[in-house]
Amino acid sequence: QGQDRHMIRMRQLIDIVDQLKNYVNDLVPEFLPAPEDVETNCEWSAFSCFQKAQLKSANTGNNERIINVSIKKLKRKPPSTNAGRRQKHRLTCPSCDSYEKKPPKEFLERFKSLLQKMIHQHLSSRTHGSEDS
């Protein structure tokens, strides 16, 4: 049940990431650590790297408020789960600084990709033999 809540939150975060992608030109063009092809059992560690990244509004135009609200939602800590706690203690996961740094557009694309991977794993884990290739 706790894991379900977590994944439901991930699904909602995908929408927020998609919204932010529409305002990518209004974000500070700073390079941010963006995990990609995250190894199994390091997903939660990579997720926390995305949440810690200093994504910022460029404070230009009329979109500043909606951008800041969306960034705040992205950074909201999900409820703790055993899976998350187990992974947190994995010393073998790369540190945030070790991931390649990318501008906001690619950062958001990679964040979305990780969220999709986590949801898909969750859905597949409930279904015996669901993965076909």
């Epitope: 049940q1 379900d4 979305k112 999709q116 949801i119 859905l123 597949s124 993965e131 290739s133």
Partner: antibody
């Protein structure tokens, strides 16, 4: 705004292979999940399967032995092949995007495929 | 497979009416439920995901609730453009499955 458009023959003979293509515009196919759903005349919707842009697939077990979904990122297209068709495969076939993995946020208008000799 | 049962199969209503459609899953699906609106010859439209989250661009008169096995889609004040068929869809496990649909008709 992402738009999807199905294309392919509207008539297929029994025992042959149904082939449809979905062309995606207004967005890149190189992220997200891309699926096929069908609706036989007078019936409800049935999920056929989907493919992740990086190649992994999930299929409905009821169709699994006959279905192949593939993606062509260079053309921003994905396709459906359904082999050994019968009259029961007559349906409106929809292609759709699933950004959230669990639901479909953009759909094509659908294309009617009739299986008949 | 998880069976999704919608009721009623059709409902007659007038503009301004409050309309409620229910969807029942054959087993618990947490909040993994989506609702779609479908008009003949048009592309289906996602209204609600994870049971109660409103899809971007969908009017606030649409709302979803429920968890476990019982779910509800409510249209608070029916508009002329809302006459359509509505489907629920579960995503708790593969295969993804849809309800049989509820047709909302003009009274």
């Amino acid at each position: 705004q992402v738009q999807l458009q199905e294309s392919g023959p509207g008539l297929v003979k029994p025992s042959e292979t149904l082939s449809l293509t979905c062309t995606v515009s207004g967005g890149s196919i190189s992220s997200d999940f891309w699926g096929w759903i069908r609706q036989p005349p007078g019936k409800g919707l049935e999920w056929i399967g989907y493919i992740y842009s990086r190649g992994s697939t999930n299929y409905n077990p009821s169709l699994k032995r006959r279905v192949t979904i593939s993606v062509d990122t260079s053309r921003n297209q994905f396709s459906l092949k359904l082999s050994s068709v019968t009259a029961a495969d007559t349906a409106v076939y929809y292609c759709a995007r699933s950004a959230g993995v669990t639901d479909f946020d953009f759909w094509g208008q659908g294309t009617l495929v009739t299986v008949s000799s | 497979d998880i069976q999704m049962t919608q009721s009623p199969s059709s409902v007659s209503a007038s503009v301004g009416d409050r309309v409620t459609i229910t969807c029942r899953a054959s087993q618990g699906i947490s909040s993994w439920l989506a609702w779609y609106q479908h008009k003949p010859g048009k592309a289906p439209k996602l209204l609600i995901y994870v049971a109660s989250s409103l899809q971007s661009g969908v009017p606030s008169r649409f709302s979803g609730s429920g968890s476990g096995t019982d779910f509800t889609l409510t249209i608070s004040s029916l508009q002329p453009e809302d006459f359509a068929t509505y489907y629920c869809q579960q995503a708790n496990s593969f295969p993804l499955t849809f309800g049989g649909g509820t047709k909302v008709e003009i009274k």
